[in-house]
Interface confidence: low
């Protein structure tokens, strides 16, 4: 016990210290001595709960001794100095280092003073996100994969998407013992509307200052979706040319466009130019259904459009509207 009327010495240390797997960490531990108080420290001792013996000792004449000399080091304690700082550095942090440690000062006249510190071992995960290229399966499949590798504790993965779908998240042991690899798949029914859109994987971990966002651009392979534009139902006999356009969306891109009519090949006044069909002026009314057939690596699809070229109304000059 200290002499009556004097302030006691206090061992100061955080209740919990975080450290990263494989890195070094300092367990801070200081002896606070009130201004008028006198104390003499003869030993600093570190031990771990549940283990016999001490893991590190600093003796005022013998200096330091460690159970694992390559992994432990007193940060500030030196022979010939006042032993007020017992802070201990641990190198190459392992999962099994997590636990409760006791820092103890052997002092005179106050006796021994100690404090407990909980060492928490963290591992900062590596995060990757990748697209899972798919076709139109008609059933839910993974379209994106987000992997948070080697986190301790496990990372928390969520998805942000305007496309619908649902996550499928699983955990497996990480490469380093005690770490966890979290794999999250974003699963939906693929459609052409999904192709080229993005989903965002959000990874949260206590080692991050802020959540990590990884955007994945989705790829859905689908056959062409075809429509024909350029006709407004108001084409009249005239000298002007008009154009129909075959609008196709597909992934991969279209490899070919083929124009025909329901009657077979194109009439002389219609000239195919890739995705466009040039309609030359005609001198008599026509009523023709044009077909545009579009091909890509996954197949062929077509669209039809019936075009009427009429005689101009009596009240106004006749003319094919130019598009």
């Amino acid at each position: 016990w200290p002499p009556p009327g004097t302030g006691d010495i206090i061992v100061q240390a955080p209740t919990q210290v975080p450290g990263f797997l494989g890195d070094s960490v300092t367990l801070p531990c200081y002896l606070q001595v009130p201004g008028m108080e006198e104390t003499h420290v003869s030993q600093l001792t570190w031990s771990r709960h549940g283990e016999s013996g001490s893991m590190a000792v600093f003796h005022q004449t013998q200096g330091p001794n460690y159970s694992e000399p390559k992994r432990l080091e007193f940060v500030a304690a030196r022979l010939g100095t006042e032993l007020r700082d017992a802070s201990l550095r641990m190198f190459g942090l392992r999962v099994e280092d997590e636990g409760n440690y006791t820092c103890l000062f052997v002092t005179f006249p106050q006796g021994s003073r100690s404090v407990d510190i909980w060492l928490r071992v963290l591992a900062k995960p590596q995060n990757t996100a990748e697209v899972q290229k798919v076709q139109l399966t008609g059933k839910p499949v993974p379209v994106a994969r987000c992997v948070s590798t080697g986190g301790r504790p496990p990372a928390h993965i969520t998805w942000h998407s305007d496309l619908g779908g649902m996550p499928n998240t699983s955990q497996a042991p990480g490469f380093l013992s005690g770490t966890v690899t979290v794999t999250s798949l974003w699963i939906l029914v693929p459609s052409s509307q999904v192709d080229g859109k993005s989903v965002t994987c959000k990874v949260e971990h206590e080692s991050f200052e802020k959540p990590q966002l990884l955007t994945v651009n989705l790829t859905v392979y689908y056959p062409p979706e075809v429509s024909i534009s350029g006709y407004d139902n108001n084409w009249y006999l005239s000298q002007n040319e008009a154009t129909l356009t075959c609008d196709a969306r597909s992934n991969p891109e279209p490899t070919g466009y083929n124009w025909s009519t329901t009657m077979g090949p194109l009439p002389p006044f219609a000239v195919a130019q890739g995705a466009q069909l040039l309609i030359r002026p005609v001198d008599k009314p026509i009523n023709t259904t044009f077909i545009c057939n579009v091909t890509n690596a996954l197949g062929a699809r077509q669209a039809e459009l019936t075009v009427q070229v009429k005689e101009g109304p009596p009240s106004e000059p006749s003319g094919m509207s130019s598009n």
């Epitope: 494989g22 590798t149 497996a172 380093l176 013992s177 690899t181 794999t183």
Partner: antibody, heavy 116, light 107 residues
Framework: EVQLVQSGSELKKPGASVKVSCKTS????????MHWVRQPHGKGLEWIGG????????SYNQRFKGRVTITVDKSTSTAYMELSSLRSEDTAVYYC?????????WGQGTLVTVSS | DIQMTQSPSAMSASVGDRVTITCKAS??????VAWYQQKPGQPPKALIY???YRYSGVPDRFSGSGSGTDFTLTISSLQAEDLAEYFC?????????FGQGTKLEIK
Amino acid sequence: EVQLVQSGSELKKPGASVKVSCKTSGYTFTEYTMHWVRQPHGKGLEWIGGIHPNQGETSYNQRFKGRVTITVDKSTSTAYMELSSLRSEDTAVYYCARWTGDFDYWGQGTLVTVSS
Amino acid sequence: DIQMTQSPSAMSASVGDRVTITCKASQNVGTNVAWYQQKPGQPPKALIYSASYRYSGVPDRFSGSGSGTDFTLTISSLQAEDLAEYFCQQYESYPYTFGQGTKLEIK
């Protein structure tokens, strides 16, 4: 394109050591764990061990502990597997394989023959 | 160590057949199972991860299922190029272990 290119075939005498290399390209070497797996002719696959290139932390199959050493050279993005005290039953094709939870990329394999 | 027991060890099937290979783990491995295809003279190629998800580029005739201790690889309609040996692997705990393989021959 991810590539794992291994060193050529080796013929060793019993008791000797062998060191097989695996040069990687097409990805960031320090972001993935590299493992070694072997396959005796006509038989199954056996995991030997692995290494995290960033920290050099290793994990070995206890069956090989004491005989195997896995190392990396970050400057050349190359992994190495050294097996000592070779015996005839170590004759096998040795593969390096990148780990992503499963082994997604493999080297072409290195045949190690142990014979007197 | 977790044992992965594959069956059958060898089988013969005709083009177009539905083929099923099973793998039984000696203890619960969740869904931490992968399947590999190894063609003669080549390294293994990953087909399935997390027990049931195909790698990009793997034909959809290949499918995986199962969790816990019982796992299945199915080829819905066998093709000539599927001639290979197939392996399962658990990555639930060290040491990682593989099944002994199933050699698939085409009739």
